[in-house]
């Protein structure tokens, strides 16, 4: 089949040359390449008023390759598509369109969001967090001894940051009140230096059990001061031990 086609081509182009350049299997002085070597694509290039056949290792941007037994040729992608594997499978859309499952869309379908960096429709990614790490030792002013009341903190990591339309991350830091080990501090003992140092007092409007650690405070909005008398504190002493309040950075 290929041989007979080759013979037909030679009859049509009596000046077929066997000393072809650049990947051509057969060519003519006037028409350039007539057929290509294996794994090369045949394309027509316009030079002035005439079209010249060329053989390319890959199709130019905006075109895709199609294989046939006797020729591999380049065909134009759809109008809204920059690069494609075929007319039904775009890999990069023209400006102003979003790529989704090989198609170029004006707007992303329901349940997906537009990524304006990659110009793709992507799944909405919700925040994922790890399990809580264990509570830190109970401390007060950085010491783990000598005081009855202190605070302990625990943290968890963000495993998956949310996309623009995804659910925000829940708190990643949690602090609660606790009872410090009932042991007398040794002379000169400073205790463990924790992040819990230099605390601000609990603030008004905030449950008094919540004492955000300094890491959270850096990126949280400042909370107005809350004052409570000793009587109120005494009243809620039992509840304090169990309760915990979460403070977190918004991600």
């Amino acid at each position: 089949q290929n041989a007979s086609r080759g013979r037909r081509q030679r009859r049509m182009h009596p000046n077929v040359s066997q000393g072809c350049q650049g990947g051509c299997a057969t060519c003519s002085d006037y028409n350039g390449c007539l057929s290509c070597k294996p794994r090369l694509f045949f394309a027509l290039e316009r030079i002035g008023m005439k079209q010249i056949g060329v053989c390319l290792s890959s199709c130019p941007s905006g075109y895709y390759g199609t294989r046939y037994p006797d020729i591999n040729k380049c065909t134009k992608c759809k109008a809204d598509c920059d690069t494609c594997f075929n007319k039904n499978f775009c890999t990069k859309c023209k400006s102003g369109f979003y790529l989704h499952l090989g198609k170029c869309l004006d707007n992303c379908p329901e349940g997906l969001e537009a990524n304006n960096h990659t110009m793709e429709c992507v799944s909405i990614v919700h925040c994922e967090v790890s399990e809580w790490n264990p509570w830190s030792p109970c401390t007060k002013k950085g010491k783990t001894c000598g005081f009855k009341r202190g605070t302990e903190t625990r943290v968890r990591e963000i495993i998956q940051h949310p996309s623009a339309k995804g659910n925000l991350c829940p708190p990643t830091n949690e602090t609660r009140k606790c009872t410090v080990q009932r042991k007398k501090c040794q002379k000169g003992e400073r205790g463990k230096k924790g992040r819990e140092r230099k605390r601000k007092k609990p603030n008004k409007g905030e449950s008094k059990e919540a004492i955000p650690d300094s890491k959270s405070l850096e990126s949280s909005k400042e909370i107005p001061e809350q004052r409570e008398n000793k009587q109120q504190q005494k009243k809620r002493k039992v509840q304090d031990k169990q309760k915990s309040v979460s403070v977190s950075t918004v991600h």
Epitope: R39, F41, S57, S58, Y64, G65, T66, R67, Y68, N72, T75, T83, F85, N86, K87, N88, F89, T91, K92, L101, G102, K103
Partner: antibody, heavy 117, light 111 residues
Framework: QVQLKQSGPELVKPGASVKISCKAS????????FHWVKQNHGKSLDWIGY????????GYNQKFKNRATLTVDTSYSTAYLEVRRLTFEDSAVYYC??????????WGQGTTLTVSS | DIVLTQSPASLAVSLGQRATISCKAS??????????MNWYQQKPGQPPKLLIY???NLESGIPARFSGSGSGTDFTLNIHPVEEEDAATYYC?????????FGAGTKLELK
């Protein structure tokens, strides 16, 4: 003669990451797109995604999008597949393949990944 | 996704006989007059090997006893006459839409 040579077998713990390589020779590396395919224990084949070596543009099967990353190093004519947060279900043979006019015409020999604790 | 259903899952054929494998797509894999369906052969411990591209075109170097036919949603791979070296698993694969998908495979054994 087109050849795709993949890196050796991998034994990895769950939760870890792995990076498999595929070195191409015998043709101009940037001419064809690279695709990666997963095969579970001699069962069917699952397409992971593709990458254009000429510009690094890549695309993924939604199934693998969040944990797989395809990259190329044109100076070494090598394509890479990285899979993160590995689970036991990721244990499989992974193939790289060149894509020529809508079919996979050359394949690597495959890289066996075993995820075990 | 386009689902490709291969049948039978396995078949046993005598040497010299015909083996026929079917692949049905959940939607058409044709576009602009071209069928984006390929067939591959895979032997144990080896990667798949392209046999037929665009539904009916024989890949270079593949024996003429392999042939492909069909369009739209129904495709067939024929092997005739079957030879000993043809014992393998055969997969159909569509390239028409994202994501690219494969059939579950048909295992050909010799009687």
């Amino acid at each position: 003669q087109v050849q795709l040579k993949q890196s050796g077998p991998e034994l990895v713990k769950p939760g870890a990451s792995v990076k498999i390589s595929c070195k191409a020779s015998g043709y101009t590396f940037t001419s064809y797109t690279f695709h990666w395919v997963k095969q579970n224990h001699g069962k069917s084949l699952d397409w992971i995604g593709y990458i254009y070596p000429s510009n690094g543009d890549s695309g993924y099967n939604q199934k693998f999008k969040n944990r797989a990353t395809l990259t190329v190093d044109t100076s070494y004519s090598t394509a890479y597949l990285e899979v993160r947060r590995l689970t036991f279900e990721d244990s499989a043979v992974y193939y790289c393949a060149t894509y020529f006019a809508n079919n996979f015409d050359y394949w690597g020999q495959g890289t066996t990944l075993t995820v075990s604790s | 996704d386009i689902v490709l259903t291969q049948s039978p899952a396995s078949l046993a054929v005598s040497l010299g006989q015909r083996a026929t494998i079917s692949c049905k797509a959940s939607q058409s894999v044709d576009y602009d007059g071209d069928s984006y369906m390929n067939w591959y052969q895979q032997k144990p411990g080896q990667p798949p090997k392209l046999l037929i591209y665009a539904a009916s075109n024989l890949e270079s170097g593949i024996p003429a006893r392999f042939s492909g036919s069909g369009s739209g949603t129904d495709f067939t791979l024929n092997i005739h006459p079957v030879e000993e070296e043809d014992a393998a698993t055969y997969y159909c694969q569509q390239s028409n839409e994202d994501p690219l998908t494969f059939g579950a495979g048909t295992k050909l054994e010799l009687k």
